[in-house]
Interface confidence: low
């Protein structure tokens, strides 16, 4: 049987927004799912299409998507078919329309004192709220003989009079959104005694100290009065001008002339016409002072030959809007061609090297002119002045590899060593001209080096091999002072490298030959059994043909290595008593003894009165305190070797004797009693 796991459900939807009707089925065999709208199959479109077995709406349409949707699942083998529950959309929408005259039937029938009804043809679901406007001003209920309900389409003027004349518009809003009338209605009910606008003043923009003219005319029977006001409601007449409008003249035809305009004259001017009857008509116009700000700086630009590039000139803020044009070499650029101006942009198509130079963006309005230069460089591919050469560099000395190129702009040079980018550090330095300096050449610097010289137009590269000329040197240099243990076997190594493999030999510093029990085997001095006489100065000599010889001097000491005769023991002492840590060592040269207590060396010169190190090496601590507890290390050392041994010191409180214990009872642990 076919079972619906998910069925479509009725839902709210927004006009033009996404929606989804879900449908999921489960069946033993393959089924195909399709959708019905009011019983008819739904065809896939870009707007409405099957998404799996669900139906997806990219943009809900209130006309095409109204009705009942049903999901149908059909098993084509058995012919079994199952249908889901019905689902529909509650589509929310709003659509603009015109303001129309509903009553009377035609404009010709509109007379003063008749009832006029206008209808707002904005519709929507849910039903929108309506707002009416006359000449852009909102109308509300209870105002001068009209009836309006914010959610009703109709505006009724009863009776309509000249004061109702004007441009009627409506807007509606609902939870879905807002729309305003697509076409407005002009209601004109004449009353000769009402002032009517003949000529309305326009906003003007003038430069400082120029003159400005506002025109204003009304007509009525009898003729209306006309008055000009400035921002602060100050009347302007030829007899009484405000102090800041001394240069204002009102002409007989109603025009207002302002000469030598200053910043304080900028603002709103109102022209008021008043008929014998009816409301005053107030017309406003603004006087703006022309202004222009500075232009932002351009960054220099680098372009490549053959490309197309654009440079945008942002016009400075200004009033009126400044006009913008580009110039090059004092000539204004055309609006077409290879190098031309498009809007505010400088366009360079198929750039040539000759296009390089200074281009100037100009901006101008009544307030003045501004300009800003941009320097355009046309990049070229670098060319070689001197490529890096295969080089032999001496170890330990500075080495140089050249990479000299030229281009516009100045090329950037980077170096690679074994394909790895060389970053400048204490050993490598790249000079401004591209030359690489290796400050102190080392053997492993012998490898491939590659330099790359680049500009935005392209790059060139070359490589060279470095061979390091190794210096004759001991590897590693022998320690100048070494010890051998008396009566034991000993070896003293000496090795060296150079451009050619050096020969190595040992000799005594006094020139005498080595005794027969001492052998020199390929640079290793071997003592079969060390005697006292083996002590002394020896020289290791490394030599090859091209580089000569080098010498290393070694002083060999024969010693009896250190052993401890007495070692400190684990010691427990009562607080306030004296602790003795014994330590005695022997060896040749005679070892010196040092003590380390709690991780610091005890300096005999700074021990203070409580501590003392005896000649034989023992450490005594008087009046011990708990903080003296810890590990103490006895270190014995001479010029040949060093040895250490350690023991812990415990400081404990002295127990109070109980009555049962006699004075001769032993303490509960092994300890020193003083």
């Amino acid at each position: 049987a076919i079972v619906f796991i998910k069925q479509p459900s009725s839902q709210d939807a927004l006009q033009g927004r996404r929606a989804l009707l879900r449908c999921e089925v489960e069946a033993p065999g393959p089924v195909h799912v399709y959708w019905l709208l009011d019983g008819a199959p739904v065809q896939d479109t870009e707007r409405r299409f099957a998404q799996g077995s669900s139906l997806s709406f990219a943009a809900v349409d209130r006309l095409q998507d109204s009705g009942t949707f049903q999901c149908v699942a059909r098993d084509d083998v058995t012919g079994e078919e199952a249908r889901s529950a019905n689902a529909s959309f509650n589509i929310k929408w709003i659509e603009a329309g015109p303001v129309v005259l509903k009553h009377p039937a035609s404009e010709a029938e509109i007379q003063p004192q008749t009832q006029v009804t206008l209808r707002c043809h904005i519709d929507g679901h849910p039903r929108p709220t309506y707002q009416w406007f006359r000449d852009g001003t909102p109308l509300s209920d209870g105002q001068s003989n009209h009836t309006v309900s914010s959610k009703e389409r109709n505006l009724t003027l009863r009776p309509a009079g000249p004061e109702h004349s004007g441009l009627y518009s409506c807007c509606a809003h609902s939870a879905f959104g807002q729309a305003c009338s697509s076409q407005n209605f002009t209601l004109s009910i004449a009353d000769e005694s009402f002032a009517r606008v003949v000529l309305a003043p326009q906003d003007v923009v003038v430069a400082r100290y120029e003159e400005a003219m506002f025109h204003c005319q009304f007509s009525a029977q009898p003729p209306p009065s006309l008055q000009w006001l400035f921002e602060d409601e100050t009347p302007i007449t030829n007899r009484s001008r405000p102090p800041h409008l001394r240069r204002a003249t009102v002409f007989a035809n109603g025009s207002l002339l302002l000469t030598q305009v200053r910043p304080r004259n900028a603002g709103i001017y109102r022209c008021i016409g008043q008929g014998q009857r009816g409301p005053p008509i107030i017309l406003e116009a603004t006087l703006h002072l022309a202004e222009i700000e500075d232009m932002p700086l351009f960054e220099p630009r680098v372009f490549t030959a053959g490309s197309e590039e654009r440079v945008t000139c942002l016009p400075p803020k200004g009033l009126p809007e400044p006009s913008v044009w580009w110039e090059h070499a004092g000539v204004r650029l055309p609006t077409h061609g290879r190098v031309y101006q498009k809007g505010h942009e400088l366009v360079l198509a198929n750039i040539a090297e000759s296009d390089a130079g200074v281009y100037t963006c100009h901006a101008a309005n009544l307030a003045g002119q501004r300009r800003q230069d941009v320097n355009i460089t046309v990049a070229t591919v670098p060319s070689w002045l001197k490529k890096p050469q295969d080089s032999q560099l001496e170890e330990g000395k500075p080495g140089y590899l050249d990479c000299l190129t030229q281009a516009t702009p100045k090329p950037t040079v980077v170096w690679y060593r074994n394909q790895m980018l060389i970053s400048e550090d204490s050993r490598f330095e790249v000079f401004k001209n591209g030359t690489l300096r290796i400050n102190s050449v080392e053997v492993y610097d012998g490898t491939w080096y590659r330099c790359m010289s680049s500009t935005p137009a392209g790059s060139i590269e070359a490589q060279a091999r470095v061979q390091v000329l190794e210096k004759l040197k001991f590897t590693p240099p022998p320690q100048p002072q070494q010890c051998m243990e008396f009566d034991k076997e000993a070896t003293v190594p000496c090795s060296a490298t150079g451009r050619e493999k050096p020969t190595i030999k040992w000799e005594r510093a006094d020139g005498s030959s080595l005794p027969e029990w001492v052998t020199d085997n390929a640079g290793t001095l071997h003592f079969a059994r060390v005697t006292r006489d083996d002590a002394g100065n020896y020289t290791c000599i490394a030599s090859n043909g091209p580089q000569g010889q080098i010498r290393a001097h070694v002083q060999l000491t024969v010693a009896v290595f250190i052993t401890f005769k007495v070692e400190p023991e684990r010691t427990t002492v009562y607080q306030g008593h004296t602790a003795l840590l014994q330590c005695e060592a022997q060896g040749d040269p005679k070892p010196l003894i040092q003590w380390k207590g709690k991780d610091r060396i005890l300096d005999p010169t700074k021990l203070g009165p409580r501590m003392h190190i005896f000649q034989n090496g023992s450490l005594v601590i008087h009046d011990v305190a708990p903080e003296d507890s810890g590990r103490y290390t006895c270190i014995a050392g001479n010029s040949c070797n060093i040895k250490h041994t350690e023991a812990p010191l415990y400081v404990v409180d002295k127990p109070v004797p109980e009555e049962s214990e006699g004075p001769g009872s032993p303490p509960p642990y092994k300890m020193i009693q003083t």
Epitope: L14, K92, R127, T129, Q131, S149, S150, K151, A175, G177
Partner: antibody, heavy 119, light 113 residues
Framework: EVQLVESGGGLVQPGGSLRLSCTAS????????VIWVRQAPGKGLEWVGI???????YYANWAKGRFTISRDTSKNTVYLQMNSLRAEDTAVYFC?????????????WGQGTLVTVSS | EIVMTQSPSTLSASVGDRVIITCQAS????????LAWYQQKPGKAPKLLIY???KLASGVPSRFSGSGSGAEFTLTISSLQPDDFATYYC?????????????FGQGTKLTVL
């Protein structure tokens, strides 16, 4: 986290003015109607005014002429300017966001700011 | 002026009880179902429970439900829990024509019996 935060409340004398701010974080307030609601001490909730996304504003009858709602989209903030304040305007003032673009019902509330009008 | 009448004004009940609060508008709502219910606890902002008359807000327990259309609406708590003792308000959306875009009920205070 989506939240509304009111500020600007405090003590003001009768006849004085106060401007409350409602700043949103986590949402763009310009996509929603914003509602101001007040609650006098121990009393119920009272609708003050609503500012729609298309810059239309409606006020409760008692608030008309004294209270003004405005918006600064760049600051994601809505303001309630209260003038000629009276003792009976003492209340916690909440700003709230509409449920969605298809309903004026309130979904999200601020925590409220207390306005006390007293001499 | 639009009036939203909530009843009862106060209500005492016990944990586990079924509670019904009604809200009646003096005129039809703007879109028949544009009503929401809120819960408020002392010193806190209201919290949305139900919107569009019957839709449960995110994170609200299923023991809360709403019904109604036009001008009469009901909030039901099927089995009262200790956390449910608070004040409940309805809020309706209207046409703005008479100056009322929104109107709250006067509130129902739910206390422990």
């Amino acid at each position: 986290e989506v939240q509304l935060v009111e500020s600007g409340g405090g003590l003001v004398q009768p006849g004085g003015s106060l401007r409350l701010s409602c700043t949103a974080s986590g949402i763009d307030l310009s996509n929603y109607a914003v509602i101001w609601v007040r609650q006098a001490p121990g009393k119920g909730l009272e609708w003050v005014g609503i500012h729609y996304t298309y810059d239309t504003t409606y006020y409760a009858n008692w608030a008309k002429g004294r209270f003004t709602i405005s918006r600064d989209t760049s600051k994601n903030t809505v303001y309630l300017q209260m003038n000629s304040l009276r003792a009976e305007d003492t209340a916690v003032y909440f700003c709230a966001r509409s449920f969605s673009d298809i309903s004026d019902l309130i979904k999200l509330w601020g925590q409220g700011t207390l306005v006390t009008v007293s001499s | 002026e639009i009036v939203m009448t909530q009843s009862p004004s106060t209500l005492s009940a016990s944990v586990g009880d079924r509670v019904i609060i009604t809200c009646q508008a003096s005129q039809s709502l703007y879109n028949n179902k544009d009503l929401a219910w809120y819960q408020q606890k002392p010193g806190k902002a209201p919290k949305l429970l139900i919107y569009e008359a019957s839709k449960l807000a995110s994170g609200v327990p299923s023991r809360f439900s709403g019904s109604g259309s036009g001008a009469e609406f009901t909030l039901t708590i099927s089995s009262l829990q200790p956390d449910d003792f608070a004040t409940y308000y309805c809020l309706g959306e209207f046409s703005c024509g008479s100056g009322d875009c929104l109107a709250f009920g006067q509130g129902t205070k739910l206390t422990v019996l």
